[in-house]
């Protein structure tokens, strides 16, 4: 069985990549980052 810890890790593994893509979009569109 997949542990709760592993599920949380898998869920969180792309958070920085999402922030990265959002920030790149923010630099173009000047959408507020808050």
């Amino acid at each position: 069985a997949v542990s709760e810890h592993q599920l949380l890790h898998d869920k969180g593994k792309s958070i920085q990549d999402l922030r990265r893509r959002f920030f790149l979009h923010h630099l173009i569109a000047e959408i507020h980052t808050a």
């Epitope: 990265r20 920030f23 790149l24």
Partner: antibody
Framework: QVQLVESGGGVVQPGRSLRLSCAAS????????MSWVRQAPGKGLEWVAT????????YYPDSVKGRFTISRDNSKNTLYLQMNSLRAEDTAVYYC???????????WGQGTLVTVSS | QLVLTQSSSASFSLGASAKLTCTLS???????IEWYQQQPLKPPKYVMD???????STGDGIPDRFSGSSSGAERYLTISSLQSEDEADYIC?????????????FGGGTKLTVLG
């Protein structure tokens, strides 16, 4: 094709100021965030500043915050870096770089050398 | 803090494959990074971004001899069929936004020498 040409480098005394320029062509300048990255002689790369497409948002590392100001004039397709209170450790080649939707520093200029020395 | 570690140099023979490593600080092992190439006396050139799952997107004009992969906190740049023009510094970089502040750090770079 994307072209970025830096200018304004030279020799300057510690404590003095200098303004670098980066002339952009081959793309819609006002549509992209722009950055400055520097490289001290024989050393690695260091991010210096980033500005959003319209100039509303600016970002700096602690090493230059309060001394350097990034700005842009979209009507002139030009990026600037105003450098005040210069120190010997600011001696470097300064590159301007353009983002894409996919990455921060996709296109680079040839660089301009700034030497801070008495 | 966010740190990238690279070996300072590596040597491989002409026509061989080179695998260069960039290691993220352990608490940042899931981060997407970028690879850059800097040939002697030239500005850096964007090579690719490389995600935690090994997927990557290459920059303009980068030959398909260049590929990326990942394992844990390590990010790899593999160059197959090495050519003399591949001799360069290869630098990794990573950015993040923390409390509406942007940070971007570079690794120290690996100087790749192509022998023969």
């Amino acid at each position: 094709q994307v072209q970025l040409v830096e200018s304004g480098g030279g020799v300057v005394q510690p404590g003095r100021s200098l303004r670098l320029s980066c002339a952009a062509s081959g793309f819609t300048f006002s549509s992209y965030g722009m950055s400055w990255v520097r490289q001290a002689p024989g050393k690695g790369l260091e991010w210096v500043a980033t500005i959003s497409s319209g100039g509303s948002y600016t970002y700096y590392p602690d090493s230059v915050k309060g001394r350097f100001t990034i700005s842009r004039d979209n009507s002139k397709n030009t990026l600037y870096l105003q450098m005040n209170s210069l120190r010997a450790e600011d001696t470097a080649v300064y590159y301007c770089a353009r983002q894409t939707t996919m990455t921060y520093f996709a296109y680079w200029g040839q660089g301009t050398l700034v030497t801070v020395s008495s | 803090q966010l740190v990238l570690t690279q070996s300072s140099s590596a040597s491989f023979s002409l026509g061989a494959s080179a695998k260069l490593t960039c290691t993220l600080s352990s608490q940042h092992s899931t981060y997407t990074i970028e690879w850059y190439q800097q040939q002697p006396l030239k500005p850096p050139k964007y090579v690719m971004d490389l995600k935690q799952d090994g997927s990557h997107s290459t920059g303009d004009g980068i030959p398909d001899r260049f590929s990326g992969s990942s394992s844990g906190a390590e990010r790899y740049l593999t160059i197959s069929s090495l050519q003399s023009e591949d001799e360069a510094d290869y630098i990794c970089g990573v950015g993040d936004t923390i409390k509406e502040q942007f940070v971007y750090v570079f690794g120290g770079g690996t100087k790749l020498t192509v022998l023969g």
